[in-house]
């Protein structure tokens, strides 16, 4: 079945931009002017999801490349990384729930948490030019809140 | 005052073309969904069709091919273009926005624009 | 597609009674499920969405349930100021967006 999608870029609260750190790995720092478009287009999906009142479940693809942010174990840690994905089949409505986000949205801050591991969020470092990754707290010193920018073509 | 004021409608011949307007006010459109449905007079709501970035728009079955929805977030502005118009798209039009990305309903409305097909 | 049919099209009640009205999807939506109350020549007004969850300032006397495919909206104690047009709304259908017909909420 189709899905909806639309074209963005996310920004972290301190204003952080999400760039390409390599061929599998996002990181966070502050861009401006020309540099602005170094940032991930991220084409977000609506997807299918365990039933919430708050959460909206979508999957984060990078635009334009068979590439989606999932959540797996590694070394019994929940992780965040870039998998590879056959483009002919992708996006879906019924999404892996590796892939699956839950997106929580409070005025205008949005919060990604995993699907597969409940209380794990897409998360930023306070630090600059630190990799993009899968915490599990909130309101500690990680960043877990996120403003969306619509991506015009 | 947080609102969606639409605009443009009227009367219009059968196979012409309009365009309607949603300005918004209090708040910024750029990064908001915005849903065009209407209302034929005496009948339920139907929706036309939403956009999210000025690529990503989906309309009903119906609609597609003859409804058009852009913006001009400059503006704070969405659209509806219509063509080839009929009488049975006589309605009032009302703009939404999206509760939440996603979410598929709509918190906010406007007052709707009447649009009348009629030789 | 996915169709929501309303039932019943025109209820008639009076103030105090307990009303409910019932939505059926042709297939599973899970919970992606809203409710509208519209008034005649204004715009319609958002009262509950994901079923169950009540819209900001709306009054605690509605309330949703289901899931699934079967849903309803139930007002507790109906008030001068319910009288009005129901409508349920799919909001979780793929690439589109449905309403149900309506139901017309009349004074007995």
């Known amino acids: 079945a189709p899905v909806r999608s639309l074209n963005c870029t996310l920004r972290d609260s301190q204003q952080k931009s999400l760039v390409m750190s390599g061929p599998y790995e996002l990181k966070a720092l502050h861009l401006q002017g020309q540099d602005m478009e170094q940032q991930v287009v991220f084409s977000m999906s609506f997807v299918q999801g365990e039933e919430s009142n708050d959460k909206i479940p979508v999957a984060l693809g990078l635009k334009e490349k068979n590439l989606y942010l999932s959540c797996v174990l590694k070394d019994d840690k929940p992780t965040l990384q870039l998998e590879s994905v056959d483009p002919k089949n992708y996006p879906k409505k019924k999404m892996e729930k590796r892939f699956v986000f839950n997106k929580i949205e409070i005025n205008n801050k949005l919060e990604f948490e995993s699907a597969q591991f409940p209380n794990w969020y897409i998360s930023t470092s306070q630090a600059e030019n630190m990799p993009v990754f899968l915490g599990g707290t909130k309101g500690g010193q990680d960043i877990t809140d996120f403003t969306m920018q619509f991506v015009s073509s | 005052e947080v609102q969606l004021v639409e605009s443009g409608g009227g009367n219009v011949q059968p196979g012409g073309s309009l365009r309607l307007s949603c300005t918004a006010s209090g708040f910024s459109l750029s990064n908001s969904a915005m849903a065009w449905v209407r209302q034929a007079p005496g009948k339920g709501l139907e929706w036309v069709g939403i956009?999210?970035?000025?690529?990503?728009?989906y309309y009903a079955s119906w609609a597609k091919g003859r409804f058009t929805i852009s913006r001009d977030n400059s503006k704070n502005t969405v659209y509806l273009q219509m063509n080839s118009l009929r009488a049975e798209d006589t309605a009032t039009y009302y703009c939404?926005?999206?509760?939440?990305?996603?979410?598929?309903?709509?918190?906010?409305w406007g007052q709707g624009t009447l649009v009348t097909v009629s030789s | 597609e996915i169709v929501m049919t309303q039932s019943p099209s025109t209820l008639s009640a009076s103030v105090g009674d307990r009303v409910i009205i019932t939505c059926q999807a042709s297939q599973s939506i899970d919970n992606w499920l809203s409710w509208y109350q519209q008034k005649p020549g204004k715009a319609p007004k958002l009262l509950i969405y994901?079923?169950?969850t009540l819209a900001s300032g709306v009054p605690s006397r509605f309330s949703g349930s289901g899931s699934g495919a079967e849903f309803t909206l139930t007002i507790s104690s109906l008030q001068p100021d319910d009288f009005a047009t129901y409508y349920c709304?799919?909001?979780?259908?793929?690439?589109?967006?449905?309403f149900g017909q309506g139901t017309k909420l009349t004074v007995l």
């Open positions: 709304q799919n909001t979780g259908g793929g690439v589109s967006i449905a």
């Open positions: 956009i999210y970035d000025s690529a990503s728009t």
């Open positions: 994901r079923a169950s």
């Open positions: 939404a926005r999206e509760r939440a990305i996603f979410s598929g309903d709509f918190a906010l």
